[in-house]
Structures are given as structure tokens and as C-alpha cells.
């Protein structure tokens, strides 16, 4: 009987117990982006640091070629922040020239690529018009939410304009996921 | 044999199991800031409410003197939102005066102090240029991510200008962390 | 004795162990809002998709009539993003007309309704002045934090102006919660 003292009862456990420290987890940080070919109408994907400084991957969560690889099915919390910076947006120049005032924008998308679906799935999008008065502007877009993922799924972060991403500091632009 | 029925198998458990309700957790909320001495080139740290209203600390996660004290090594999700508010930024005044248009900015940094590294580590930064047309402006900066912390580490939230922080409501400006 | 090999010790476990996959969780996504009556000085609540596309509820976390229903007491991480979009805010029109320059604003509130308290409790608020130069603007407000909730509590997302919410894509505007 003693052996059962702290063994969870049948009512409490509907799935295998597992130690929290054993769950797939990753926090990736920004690196300088090398220009890569990307297709028309498709936002380019960022690549990331996965082991230096604050960055890590653990418990079979691997990073390869812009993708976080999901090693185990389950519910994951996924997050990213991208800090953008630029010179005065064209918006104000267009406005001064008296042309239609269409604002510029900055967009971050966290995308899932899965075997079971032919198209990538946009999980999260943060998009913001940029129509700044100042000559230099900078601002972050933060995203985070929970999704049910399958083993073998791949996650990436796409941005509207890779040249506007602030890659100078690991605390400004990052991407992470962890199994709940 | 019966005693083993729900004991996790060797394959499933690589670290001690622990009850989720027993994990260190804190959610701190804003209080009116008393001016404190801070040193040159160092953003001032906010202090926080830790037990009234929505605020709490539990399971050995303690708050003292601007710091959340990490009681146990592991992976933590850390988050903060700071709502800033101000009058028209100097940016537009500078612009009107015809001087170079350098935008003002607002910045939040979540900082770790650890005894295993000689200087504070910036974990997360949200920084935004402020160049508002309106006479009064207000806006939040939100941050959140996962980090591996050590027992004894200290976390704080630093801001670029403590006088711009909206301390009026506990739901506008807050800081929290929990062991995953 | 063998039966105890991986059973957690008394020191490690202070509450019943439970499988992570069995915890209440939900991720809700935006739908087109039908105009509903809301009381003066009270922000309207959004309603949500709870089962199509990326949306789901599981493990007794239910969605009904704009509310997430909390099935079990504990600490929950709650999050939402609302993307707003609009035409030029009145702010700039007021300014051109020489009247006092009061900025417009956009606000998101995550609210808890509980049996044990007569008033709804605002858990999280993101509020931002909008005083855009461009003719069309769009931007997200993101919120997320941890709260101690009671069985039977209800969560909703309120916004300052339902007509400004971008309901076009499930990745732009969403609401979720999960038991830690």
C-alpha cells in the first residue's frame, strides 16, 4: 500500500505524466539577416540564433534553416517580437506630393508548415500602418498564443520587409515556443 | 504490481515530477513610483504591488525592492506591460523649430541580475519612437518570453522615463513570471 | 520498493499531480461582429469562433455567448490580440479646425465576471491614442498575463469601438486562456 502513497489516482490522470523539465522548448534570438530569395507575394522568413547568448533549444526541439521543428504533438505557446526601424515612411512624402495617402505598413506573421496541409498556415499576424512624422522611427510588434501542433510541424517567422528588422540586439527581436 | 499502475515509466520521466500548483509564480501590478536615485546611463527600475488587488506571489517567488527573486532554477515565462502617457513629444516641437527631427522614444527593459555574471543581462526590450501629432498620447509596450533562470537570480523592469509611466490602474502596467 | 522507484517523494509534491494534456485550454478567433446592445459607459464585448480553423476549446473549458467559462480553479495565462483599423482619426480633423486636440483612442480590456463579486473586474487593459496622419490606419493591441481564477468565473474581451475591429482573419484578432 505504501508504494501507492503519492501515485496519482485513476481519476486524476488521463494521459501519461511527464516531467516539465523534459518538454520541448526554444527561445531564438535575432541575427543579421543574409538576403535570401523569396517568392513574389510571399513574406521572407527570418533566420535565428539558437545557441549563443540567451538563445537555446532543448528536449528535441530543433532549429534548422529558419524553422523550429516540432518534435512532439501537443499544445504549444508560440511567441515572437520583431522590432522594426526605418527612415521616414513614404507615407509622409506621398502626402507632401499631394498623391493619395496610402500608409506604409510593417507586418509579422508566425507561420506553420505541416505535412498534412499543402499550404502554410498563418497562426499569428501583427500588422501596423506606419505613417511617421519623425525622420527615424522604430517600434516592436509582439505576438503570442497557444496552438495545437503535430509532430513534424515547422514554425517560422515571416516579415513584410527584412531590411527594416532591427537585428542589433538579442532582446529586441526573438522567437520562441514551448510545449504546455 | 498494482502500486505501479500509474507510476510513470522510466522512459517518460527524466526529472522529478512536481505538482503544477506548487510552482513559483508572481503577477505584480503598478504602484505610484517614488523618485529614487538611479545612476547615470542606467534606466530606473519600477517598483510594484505584490499582494493587493490582482497582484500575488506564491510558492517561494518573492518580491523585494524592485526585484522578483527566483527561488528555483528552471525555465520561466516572464512578461510585462508598461503603459506610457505624455504630452506632445518634443519631436513635433523640434520639427516646428526647424531643428533636426530626432524622435523621442519610450523603452521597457526586463533585466536579469545574476551572481554568475558580472553585469545585468537585458532579457527583453521593447522600444518605440514617439513622435505624436496629438497633444496627449498614451500607449502600451508589451513583452513576454521564456528564459532559463538560476536560483537566486533577480528580475526587474526598467523604463526610459519613470515620469511617463501610467500608474493609475493595475491592469495597464504589470510584471509577472512563472516557472514552466 | 520497486513500485516507488519513480513515484514523486513527499517533499516534491504538495498537490495532486495531473497530466498536462488534461488541462482546460482555449484559443478563440475573431468572427464578424453582429451589432449588440451595450450599456452606456460600458465597452461592448466581442464574440468569437470556438471550433473552426485555429480555434478550439478543450478539457471542460467552454465558450458561450461571448464568455470563456472557467471550469476549474487555478492560475491561468490569459491573452488576446485585437487588430483595429480605421480611416483618419478625428484627431487630425479637429486639429485642422483649430479646436482642442483631444486624441481618439483604441482600447482592449480582458474582463472577469465572477459570482463572488458584483462588479466585473478588469484584468488587463491595452489602450492607445490614435492620431494618425495617414488616411487609413491599422494596428494591433496585444495583452497577456497570469491570473488566479475560480471555477465558474467568466472571461470576455471588451473593446472601445467594435466597428474598428479587424474581423477579416483569424490570426489578427484572437483570445485564449490555459491553466498553468
Amino acid at each position: 500500500l505504501k508504494g501507492q502513497e503519492f501515485a496519482p489516482s485513476h481519476q486524476q490522470v488521463y494521459a501519461p505524466l511527464r516531467a516539465d523539465g523534459d518538454k520541448p522548448r526554444a527561445h531564438l534570438t535575432v541575427v543579421r539577416q543574409t538576403p535570401t530569395q523569396h517568392f513574389k507575394n510571399q513574406f521572407p522568413a527570418l533566420h535565428w540564433e539558437h545557441e549563443l547568448g540567451l538563445a537555446f533549444t532543448k528536449n528535441r526541439m530543433n532549429y534548422t534553416n529558419k524553422f523550429l521543428l516540432i518534435p512532439e504533438s501537443g499544445d504549444y505557446f508560440i511567441y515572437s517580437q520583431v522590432t522594426f526601424r526605418g527612415m521616414t515612411s513614404e507615407c509622409s512624402e506621398i502626402r507632401q506630393a499631394g498623391r493619395p495617402n496610402k500608409p506604409d505598413s510593417i507586418t509579422v506573421v508566425i507561420t506553420k508548415v505541416t505535412d498534412s496541409y499543402p499550404e502554410p498556415t498563418q497562426l499569428l499576424m501583427g500588422t501596423k500602418s506606419v505613417c511617421e512624422v519623425g525622420s527615424n522611427w522604430f517600434q516592436p510588434i509582439y505576438l503570442g498564443a497557444m496552438f495545437s501542433l503535430q509532430e513534424g510541424d515547422k514554425l517560422m517567422v515571416n516579415v513584410s520587409d527584412i531590411s527594416l528588422v532591427d537585428y542589433t540586439k538579442e532582446d529586441k527581436t526573438f522567437f520562441g515556443a514551448f510545449l504546455l | 504490481l498494482k502500486g505501479q499502475e500509474f507510476a510513470p515509466s522510466h522512459q517518460q520521466v527524466y526529472a522529478p515530477l512536481r505538482a503544477d500548483g506548487d510552482k513559483p509564480r508572481a503577477h505584480l501590478t503598478v504602484v505610484r513610483q517614488t523618485p529614487t536615485q538611479h545612476f547615470k546611463n542606467q534606466f530606473p527600475a519600477l517598483h510594484w504591488e505584490h499582494e493587493l488587488g490582482l497582484a500575488f506571489t506564491k510558492n517561494r517567488m518573492n518580491y523585494t525592492n524592485k526585484f522578483l527573486l527566483i527561488p528555483e532554477s528552471g525555465d520561466y515565462f516572464i512578461y510585462s506591460q508598461v503603459t506610457f502617457r505624455g504630452m506632445t513629444s518634443e519631436c513635433s516641437e523640434i520639427r516646428q523649430a526647424g531643428r533636426p527631427n530626432k524622435p523621442d522614444s519610450i523603452t521597457v527593459v526586463i533585466t536579469k541580475v545574476t551572481d554568475s555574471y558580472p553585469e545585468p543581462t537585458q532579457l527583453l526590450m521593447g522600444t518605440k519612437s514617439v513622435c505624436e501629432v496629438g497633444s496627449n498620447w498614451f500607449q502600451p509596450i508589451y513583452l513576454g518570453a521564456m528564459f532559463s533562470l538560476q536560483e537566486g537570480d533577480k528580475l526587474m523592469v526598467n523604463v526610459s522615463d519613470i515620469s511617463l509611466v501610467d500608474y493609475t490602474k493595475e491592469d495597464k502596467t504589470f510584471f509577472g513570471a512563472f516557472l514552466l | 520498493l520497486k513500485g516507488q522507484e519513480f513515484a514523486p517523494s513527499h517533499q516534491q509534491v504538495y498537490a495532486p499531480l495531473r497530466a498536462d494534456g488534461d488541462k482546460p485550454r482555449a484559443h478563440l478567433t475573431v468572427v464578424r461582429q453582429t451589432p449588440t446592445q451595450h450599456f452606456k459607459n460600458q465597452f461592448p464585448a466581442l464574440h468569437w469562433e470556438h471550433e473552426l480553423g485555429l480555434a478550439f476549446t478543450k478539457n471542460r473549458m467552454n465558450y458561450t455567448n461571448k464568455f470563456l467559462l472557467i471550469p476549474e480553479s487555478g492560475d491561468y495565462f490569459i491573452y488576446s490580440q485585437v487588430t483595429f483599423r480605421g480611416m483618419t482619426s478625428e484627431c487630425s480633423e479637429i486639429r485642422q479646425a483649430g479646436r482642442p486636440n483631444k486624441p481618439d483612442s483604441i482600447t482592449v480590456v480582458i474582463t472577469k465576471v465572477t459570482d463572488s463579486y458584483p462588479e466585473p473586474t478588469q484584468l488587463l487593459m491595452g489602450t492607445k491614442s490614435v492620431c494618425e496622419v495617414g488616411s487609413n490606419w491599422f494596428q494591433p493591441i496585444y495583452l497577456g498575463a497570469m491570473f488566479s481564477l475560480q471555477e465558474g468565473d467568466k472571461l470576455m474581451v471588451n473593446v472601445s469601438d467594435i466597428s474598428l475591429v479587424d474581423y477579416t482573419k483569424e490570426d489578427k484578432t484572437f483570445f485564449g486562456a490555459f491553466l498553468l
Partner: antibody, heavy 116, light 106 residues
Framework: QVQLVQSGAEVKKPGASVKVSCKAS????????MHWVRQAPGQGLEWMGR????????KYDPKFQVRVTMTTDTSTSTVYMELSSLRSEDTAVYYC?????????WGQGTTVTVSS | EIVLTQSPGTLSLSPGERATLSCRAS?????MYWYQQKPGQAPRPWIY???NLASGVPDRFSGSGSGTDYTLTISRLEPEDFAVYYC?????????FGGGTKLEIK
Amino acid sequence: QVQLVQSGAEVKKPGASVKVSCKASGFDIQDTYMHWVRQAPGQGLEWMGRIDPASGHTKYDPKFQVRVTMTTDTSTSTVYMELSSLRSEDTAVYYCSRSGGLPDVWGQGTTVTVSS
Amino acid sequence: EIVLTQSPGTLSLSPGERATLSCRASSSVSYMYWYQQKPGQAPRPWIYATSNLASGVPDRFSGSGSGTDYTLTISRLEPEDFAVYYCQQWSGNPRTFGGGTKLEIK
């Protein structure tokens, strides 16, 4: 400027205790960690332990665990190291230092002589 | 505890020469720290987190290494560089120092 000023030299008899102080200026000690290191004559450096002045939390080298006590008085920005049951081999220069904030600063040292 | 072994114990060189001081850990550490000490003075922080020079340290000094093997290098010795150098690890408790390398004028 940032500095640590330690108390003066001490001469103690075997079996007695000594309490060395270290007063900080130019920074808030609660923002850092304070360490104690000793150096016996002609020998190398030996880490004794550290205190987190914000929480009072200490970590000691097991070698000193039963004899050393580190404390803080935040109102005066001072940390203390008390070593009990002194023996002749405790004769050394005792240094306080800080970590968690650059520059990594050391006190000038306090000479403790244990002699009968 | 993690034992740090410094070699050589004493290094005799002339000004203008290159000096290489070694510190080996008994198990892997994240970073190494180096201190300079002159007779009658407190140790001075010299290199932190393996390769970062403390304020005021000339750039003829450099630090490198990872895992268990770390090195302090002085590209061209100046008279004021002759002193004792200690390595220290902060990765495991207790913190430990190496026994020191005495850099003396030949």
C-alpha cells in the same frame, strides 16, 4: 564613484569570532550581490560565499558553511561577514567584492590575524 | 567542486614578449574570469566572461576558451603587466579560483 570600504585590521584569539564590515557607496547594494574572498599570506584566493542584499539569501562554500555568517544592513549600505571558531589558519586578508553590476569592484581588504 | 588548474605556476618573460597563461577546469564551465594582483594590493578584475576586458585594461590583453580550457594572452608584455593572474569560475558552487600564475621579469 563606485567603491567598497572595509573595516580595519583585527587581531583575535583562537576560538573567538570576527565580524568584518564592507560599506558600499555609489550604487545600491540591493541591485547586486556581495561576495567575500580571503587570501592567506603568500597563498591564492579563496571564495567564502556571497549574499544577495535584496533578499538576504546566502550561498557559502561548504568549507565555511558552519562557521560563516553573511548579513546586510541596507539602511547603511553595509554588508558583514562574521567568522566564528577562529583558528590560526584563518589568518588572512578578507576582501568583499560585488557582482551583478560592472565594474566588478573589490574592497581594500581587512587583515585578520589569529594568534594566541 | 570544480577545480581550476593554472599553468605554468611561474612564467618568466621579458618585456615585448608574448605571454600565454592557461587555466583548465575539472569540468565544463560557461565562462572564465581573470584577476590581476600586485603585491600588497587587492585583486583587480581583468577579464570577465572569458573575453571581455574590464574597464581600463589595455587591448594587448585578450581572453579566450570554452568548456574546460581557457587562456589569457598578452600580445606584447609591458613592465606594468608583471603580476600574479588568477582565473575564477562562476558556473558552479562553490566559486573557485585557480592557484595563480606569477608573471615575472626574466
